[in-house]
Interface confidence: low
């Protein structure tokens, strides 16, 4: 949209001279601009490219006899070079140029620190045409300035493929100090020195720093920013902050807590997840880490048995994932288990002790005196043995497992039988004649199957043979016996 500012015509002289005007600190108003009688100044906005002049409806008169005139070099008129103002104030500044009417299609753009200002900036270009020249005034306004508006602003005009550049206008926005580095929270060792850093900038400079510990100033004389505070050591938690001062006032940093590293709290909630005959899987919830990362944990295991010597087994493990499988335990035993974890300062107290039990183990010895003989009349093999001397930890005997392997003419077949715990003999049917039968027996408890006895072999002849001599477990160290009938 084009907005016209209509004023009553006043008798001003022609407009080739320098524009009057001055810029006020913290706020500038658009200059009142002279114009010749018969011309009305038009304020031109570009709806598509703010900051570019909109010349579509403005007639800049041609000078047809341009060849006969010597035109002076074009240049922007000098204006205020430096504007200082406080944050959140408004500012307006401009550049102006008189352009002979011979030139057409002039465009003015604003640049800040070498980059063109496009988009939603408040730029207005006004045109004041006369018989021979047109005065062009480009204004730039910023409402509620911020530090980011600091910089060097220039106008550029493109005319007949030539670029004309104005002198820079330096905008300096002053405000309260702005922190570029604030102190950070730390976890420190008791009575050990550490450093805190604070840095703030203006403008205006200089910026002075005061340090504050637990609401009390640490330094009586301020230090110029940046400042490093060396704390010789603390015995208890403290909160530090820094104050940054300049001519505009004071800014306070965030308060940071300095924690004193301590030994961790004991773990809690030790839980049993799984028990076997010789292992227990536990988990725990770590306690408070004492402001220092956990390094590792120690699982302490005591056998709960009046006859045990009360020694403690210690298993070291990583601090994560708060689980450990305790191994090398006795079967059918009661244990008291505690967990302690350490950080760089030391070990926590032990967690509350919990009771856990291992399950029955498998027997550790095989049945004794295994004897095998053929009862041909009933086509059976008789097997006899003696109950093994099992330890209490193996649990209650629930039975026996009998393995008998039949080998004949290169063919081998294994069969398994289960018999009850009250038995010390068994009969198995002859599977194949003219074959070797190899028998082994193992004791079974709820904890599992124990070792098998040494193999006893017996030869099963073809039908009609008579000898029924037994085969039996050999003495230790002897070769496997083979009884051929």
């Amino acid at each position: 949209a084009i907005t016209e500012a209509r004023e009553e015509a006043k008798p001003y002289p022609l407009f080739p001279g320098p524009l009057p005007g001055s810029l006020q600190t913290d706020h500038t108003s658009l200059l009142s601009l002279p114009h010749t009688s018969g011309y009305q100044p038009a304020l031109m906005f570009s709806p598509t490219q703010p900051g570019r002049p909109y010349t579509g409806n403005v007639a800049i008169p041609r000078v047809t006899s341009a060849g006969s005139k010597l035109l002076p070099p074009l240049a922007f008129k000098h204006t205020v070079g430096h504007i200082i103002l406080s944050e959140h104030k408004d500012v307006k500044f401009n550049c102006s140029i008189s352009v002979p009417n011979i030139y057409q299609d002039t465009t003015i753009s604003w640049w800040k620190d070498g980059k063109e200002l496009l988009g939603a900036h408040h730029a207005i270009t006004q045109f004041y045409p006369d018989d021979e020249v047109t005065a062009i005034i480009a204004s730039f306004s910023i409402t509620s300035v911020q530090r980011s508006d600091n910089g060097s602003y220039i106008c550029k005009m493109k005319i007949n493929n030539e670029e004309i550049v104005s002198d820079p206008i330096y905008i300096e926005v002053q405000g309260l100090p702005h922190f570029t580095k604030q102190p950070e929270s730390m976890n420190v060792t008791r009575n050990t020195a550490f450093n805190l850093t604070c840095q703030a900038v203006g403008p205006p400079e200089p910026v002075n720093i005061f340090w504050v510990q637990n609401s009390s100033r640490v330094n009586e004389q301020p230090e110029k920013s940046p400042s490093v505070l060396t704390v010789p050591g603390l015995t208890e938690m403290a909160v530090f902050s820094c104050e940054a001062h300049n001519d505009k006032g004071l800014t306070v940093s965030k308060g940071v807590q300095i924690n004193i590293k301590a030994i961790p709290s004991p773990p809690t909630e030790v839980s049993i997840h799984n028990s076997t005959a010789h292992s227990i899987l536990i988990s725990w919830v770590p306690g408070f880490d004492g402001y220092s990362p956990f390094r590792n944990c120690s699982v302490q295991v005591k056998e709960v048995d009046p006859l045990s010597n009360g020694s403690v087994m210690i298993f070291n493990t990583s601090a994560s994932p708060h689980m450990y499988q305790i191994k090398q335990l006795q079967a059918l035993a009661n244990y008291s288990i505690g967990v302690s974890c350490m950080n760089e300062i030391g070990w926590s107290a032990v967690s509350p002790w919990i009771l856990a039990s291992t399950t029955e183990g498998a027997p550790s010895v095989a049945p004794l005196n295994v004897t095998v003989f053929l009862n041909e009349s009933r086509d059976n093999v008789d097997i006899r043995w003696m109950k093994p001397l099992t330890k209490r930890q193996a649990g209650e005997l629930v039975g026996y497992r009998i393995s008998h392997v039949w080998q004949s003419a290169g063919i081998s077949k294994e069969l398994l039988e289960e018999v009850g715990q009250n038995n010390s003999r068994a009969q198995i049917s002859v599977q194949v004649h003219n074959a070797t039968c190899t028998v082994r027996i193992a004791a079974v408890t709820k904890g599992g199957v124990g070792p098998f006895s040494d193999p006893v072999k017996i030869f099963i002849p073809a039908h009609g043979w008579v000898d029924h001599a037994p085969s039996s477990t050999p003495a230790p160290g002897n070769a496997d016996p083979v009884l051929i009938i």
């Epitope: 809690t268 909630e269 839980s271 049993i272 899987l281 919830v285 994560s320 994932p321």
Partner: antibody, heavy 122, light 106 residues
Framework: QVTLKESGPGILQPSQTLSLTCSFS??????????VGWIRQPSGKGLEWLAH???????YYEPALKSRLTISKDSSKNQVFLKIANVDTADTATYYC??????????????WGTGTTVTVSS | QIVLSQSPAILSAFPGEKVTMTCRAT?????MHWYQQKPGSSPKPWIY???NLTSGVPARFSGSGSGTSYSLTISRVEAEDAATYYC?????????FGGGTKLEIK
């Protein structure tokens, strides 16, 4: 985005073995702290935790069902499996798999699958 | 085994009312977790580690408790809160769920 999807046979007969698969995306079971669990819910009844497996291959089972349950994983395929042996009509339920959130001092099921319905019927 | 008992089994409330459901454990647990389930949907984590609301849970929900007694409270019930809420402990294997409290809106 983390998602989990259960799949199973739908219907099977008593004494058969139920095989369930949980296929997931958005996380890896090779990463520290990751776990996946199985929970079931008979129609109109409450939830029952069955088993779960951690990234380091530790496995935990509901003690009353432990002898029938087997949980396993294939981290490269982003899958977790549950087998229930010797099923009975009491195993008829919707079976869910869920990712476990591993906090510093707590754990909970933070993302659940949509569930797969399993019917055991002769 | 830690048994979790939820009460009441069914809770009826008018919109805008304040309601509280409880979960009691037969042994002490460190944290309680709560899940919301609507018919035909899978459970959703609702409150974890006793009092932390999961992302997207309205601030009218809160959790509290310790030891063997925990509760879930809704300060002003809305129609969308109608669901069954389950408590769950992860302190001791087996990791049990409560039987659920069904919240009905009148």
């Amino acid at each position: 985005q983390v998602t989990l999807k259960e799949s199973g046979p739908g219907i099977l007969q008593p004494s058969q073995t139920l095989s369930l698969t949980c296929s997931f995306s958005g996380f890896s079971l090779s990463t520290f702290g990751m776990g996946v669990g199985w929970i079931r819910q008979p129609s109109g009844k409450g939830l029952e935790w069955l088993a779960h497996i951690w990234w380091y291959d530790d496995k935990y089972y509901e003690p009353a069902l432990k002898s029938r349950l087997t949980i396993s994983k294939d981290s490269s395929k982003n899958q977790v499996f549950l087998k229930i042996a010797n099923v009975d009509t009491a195993d008829t339920a919707t079976y869910y798999c869920a990712r476990i959130y591993y906090g510093t001092s707590y754990r909970y099921f933070d993302v659940w699958g949509t569930g797969t319905t399993v019917t055991v019927s002769s | 085994q830690i048994v979790l008992s939820q009460s009441p089994a069914i809770l009826s409330a008018f919109p805008g009312e304040k309601v509280t459901m409880t979960c009691r454990a037969t042994s002490s647990v460190r944290y309680m977790h709560w899940y919301q389930q609507k018919p035909g949907s899978s459970p959703k984590p609702w409150i974890y580690a006793t009092y932390n609301l999961t992302s997207g849970v309205p601030a009218r929900f809160s959790g509290s408790g310790s030891g063997t007694s925990y509760s879930l409270t809704i300060s002003r019930v809305e129609a969308e809160d109608a669901a069954t809420y389950y408590c769950h402990q992860w302190s001791s294997n087996p990791y049990t769920f409560g039987g659920g409290t069904k919240l009905e809106i009148k």
